[in-house]
């Protein structure tokens, strides 16, 4: 039985040209996280963090995606096209797969706030 829950930064907004942290956190389970996948709204993979192999950033995003903090992902040099859904997929043993969703809105406005429900140090 899957007992864990994924908390995410939820709906966030950030300025065009700026950067944003996408963060998921798995709690309420003792399952071991073996891999985390980060996907964009069109299901294209941005990055994978494997427990043994470490981070792999996919070539199309190499210039604009930085690994971390933790199992999160930092998107840089944001464009309006970055608006949309992002998914973290946690592969865990022995629970299986947990999935979290974040909605990012990229704003032209200089008053855009990067609001997050929580931040992991």
């Amino acid at each position: 039985m899957m007992t864990g829950t994924i908390e995410t930064t939820g709906n966030i907004s950030a300025k065009k040209g700026g950067s944003v942290i996408l963060q998921c956190h798995l709690s309420s389970t003792m399952a071991q996280v073996t891999q985390v996948n980060w996907e964009q709204h069109d299901h294209s993979l941005l990055a994978i963090r494997n427990a043994e192999l470490g981070w792999h950033i996919y070539p199309a995003f190499k210039d604009r995606v930085a690994p971390g903090p933790g199992l999160g992902l930092t998107l840089q040099s944001l464009t309006m096209n970055d608006t949309g859904e992002y998914f973290c997929t946690y592969h865990t043993y022995p629970d299986g797969t947990y999935r979290g969703r974040i909605f990012l809105e990229v704003l032209e406005s200089s008053v855009a706030e990067h609001s997050a429900r929580f931040q992991i140090p």
Partner: antibody
Framework: QVQLVQSGSELKKPGASVKVSCKAS????????MNWVRQAPGRGLEWMGW????????AYAQDFTERFVFSLDTSVTTAYLQISSLKAEDTAVYYC?????????????WGQGTLVTVSS | DIQLTQSPSFLSASVGDRVTITCRAS??????LAWYQQKPGKAPRVLIY???TLQSGVPSRFSGSESGTEFTLTISSLQPEDLATYYC?????????FGQGTKVEIK
């Protein structure tokens, strides 16, 4: 190359305790979950449970919650199985086995097994 | 808990025969199923994982298939060295239990 090397056979009296070790080499112990499997003489494989090698937290299958303890010493890359208050029915070969961390799990490396015999 | 029922528990076949072992799950386990071979006096070794993926170094005469909650291990042409007991295992959730085993004897 990846290896799991277990401690040697043990002969114990009922009521005694035993600690079986599983020395991991050729990979980073803390990246891969570790499992323990029991095989009584002439019987099949029983999954006893596993230990989260990242946090050190153990989880036990239903029949192994009472007298069985999984632990780790990451400084010597070794997993341990301790059984207390031994009974004759604990006589078995005990295996440690590593969970492969592909997205579809399986036990890709096994120790050679440790025979624990409980007899008065 | 999800139960695995493996059949047959014993089979005897001749060298060159096609051998099929079945494992039924009491509920859906997706493709989280592995097959192991255990030769007498030895530790088990994985043959198939993810229901159908052949482990590196395992002869291609071994194959796995799935249909709903029924999983099959097939040995296309039995060899003398295939004398062993074969186990299925579910890995979709705790407990990661094994089937009862199938002992394969060479006629």
């Amino acid at each position: 190359q990846v290896q799991l090397v277990q401690s040697g056979s043990e002969l114990k009296k009922p009521g005694a305790s035993v600690k079986v070790s599983c020395k991991a080499s050729g990979y980073t112990l803390t990246n891969y979950p570790m499992n323990w499997v029991r095989q009584a003489p002439g019987r099949g494989l029983e999954w006893m449970g596993w230990i989260n090698t990242n946090t050190g937290s153990p989880a036990y299958a239903q029949d192994f919650t009472e007298r069985f303890v999984f632990s780790l010493d990451t400084s010597v890359t070794t997993a341990y199985l301790q059984i207390s208050s031994l009974k004759a029915e604990d006589t078995a070969v005990y295996y440690c086995a590593r969970t492969a961390i592909t997205s579809v799990y399986h036990f890709d490396y096994w120790g050679q097994g440790t025979l624990v015999t409980v007899s008065s | 808990d999800i139960q695995l029922t493996q059949s047959p528990s014993f089979l005897s076949a001749s060298v060159g025969d096609r051998v099929t072992i079945t494992c039924r799950a009491s509920q859906g386990i997706s493709s989280y199923l592995a097959w192991y071979q255990q030769k007498p006096g030895k530790a088990p070794r994985v043959l198939i994982y993810g229901a159908t993926t052949l482990q590196s170094g395992v002869p291609s005469r071994f194959s796995g298939s799935e249909s709903g909650t029924e999983f099959t291990l097939t040995i296309s042409s039995l060899q003398p060295e295939d004398l062993a007991t074969y186990y299925c295992q579910k890995l979709n959730s705790h407990p990661c239990s094994f089937g009862q085993g199938t002992k394969v004897e060479i006629k």
